[in-house]
Interface confidence: medium
């Protein structure tokens, strides 16, 4: 739930559940800032706009990241 | 199983302290935001505090702010409760909950674990 | 502050007949952050509905929710003997707050 305070993180909870990156509309990668010390990945899915926030930490969510970031290369000229 | 199970309670007088633990087994605590619940005798339900799975976001009822502080510490797999200069109306079963499983942050899916209480009572 | 008021505060109904509870808000939830909880004496809470109307895992079918704006619903089809209780609806509200209602108790008739 985004909450709205002194520490402006999004993310409560996190998952650790396996997304297909065809599923992916969007994927942010937040860095941390002053607002919150620790970085967020949330995705925004294809279905409904839902958007999930992912564990960093995560082995799922690292081949995830890395899946993504070989596409957006091949894609890149 | 998936198990919460809080400790610490007791009798203490008005004004003082005490610290609720919450050990939590058989999910990856570190990934789940958790809150703390109470209720008082014969009564309903309130909610106390929530914390955010890294301990970053924090929030509290008006009845508690700056009396009560949440924490956690995910290498223990623990929540607590730090209750000061506490007050008769304190007094209550207080309930360890994990925020539901949902993973659509614009969504909110409730608390699907709870624990089976830890009883405080204040009184002089 | 949103305030949850629940109607009737008591409920007293037969097994096998169809109890409906209502929850009203001060003012308009987002049916997302909406929740019912079932409790019976001596025990913690169950989550029952989440999202105004996803029923929680293990919950039966004869347990709905429904509703919008200030006006929410559970509605339990057939009253098993099990299912005498109390029921809460509650609210999530940035700041955080998490609103319970006072709770309804449906009891034996």
């Known amino acids: 739930i985004p909450l709205s305070r002194t520490v402006r993180c999004t993310c409560i909870s996190i998952s650790n559940q396996p997304v297909n990156p065809r599923s992916l509309e969007k994927l942010e990668i937040i860095p941390p800032s002053q607002f919150c010390p620790h970085v967020e990945i949330i995705a925004t899915m294809k279905k409904k706009g839902e958007k999930r926030c992912l564990n960093p930490e995560s082995k799922a969510i690292k081949n995830l990241l890395k899946a993504v970031s070989k596409e957006r290369s091949k894609r890149s000229p | 199983q998936v198990q919460l199970v809080e400790s610490g309670g007791g009798v203490v007088q008005p004004g003082r302290s005490l610290r609720l633990s919450c050990a939590a087994s058989?999910?990856?605590?570190?990934?789940?935001?958790m809150h703390w619940v109470r209720q008082a005798p014969g009564k309903g339900l309130e909610w106390v505090a929530v914390?955010?799975?890294?301990?970053?976001?924090?929030g509290y009822a008006d009845s508690v702010k700056g009396r009560f502080t949440i924490s956690r510490d995910n290498s223990k797999n623990t929540l607590y409760l730090q209750m000061n200069s506490l007050r008769a109306e304190d007094t209550a079963v207080y309930y360890c909950?994990?925020?539901?499983?949902?993973?659509?942050?614009?969504?909110?899916?409730?608390?699907?674990?709870w624990g089976q209480g830890t009883t405080v009572t204040v009184s002089s | 502050e949103i305030v949850l008021t629940q109607s009737p505060g008591t409920l007293s109904l037969s097994p096998g007949e169809r109890a409906t509870l209502s929850c009203r808000a001060s003012?308009?939830?987002?049916?997302?952050?909406l929740a019912w909880y079932q409790q019976k004496p001596g025990q913690a809470p169950r989550l029952l509905i989440y999202?105004?109307?996803s029923r929680a895992t293990g919950i039966p079918d004869r347990f709905s929710g429904s509703g919008s704006g200030t006006d929410f619903t559970l509605t339990i089809s057939r009253l098993e003997p099990e299912d005498f209780a109390v029921y809460y609806c509650?609210?999530?509200?940035?700041?955080?707050?998490?609103?319970f209602g006072p709770g309804t108790k449906v009891d034996i008739k």
């Open positions: 909950a994990r925020e539901g499983a949902g993973s659509n942050i614009y969504y909110y899916y409730g608390m699907d674990v």
């Open positions: 999202g105004a109307s």
């Open positions: 003012q308009s939830v987002s049916s997302s952050y």
């Open positions: 509650q609210q999530y509200g940035s700041s955080p707050i998490f609103t």
């Open positions: 058989g999910f990856t605590f570190s990934e789940y935001g």
């Open positions: 914390i955010g799975f890294a301990g970053l976001i924090k």
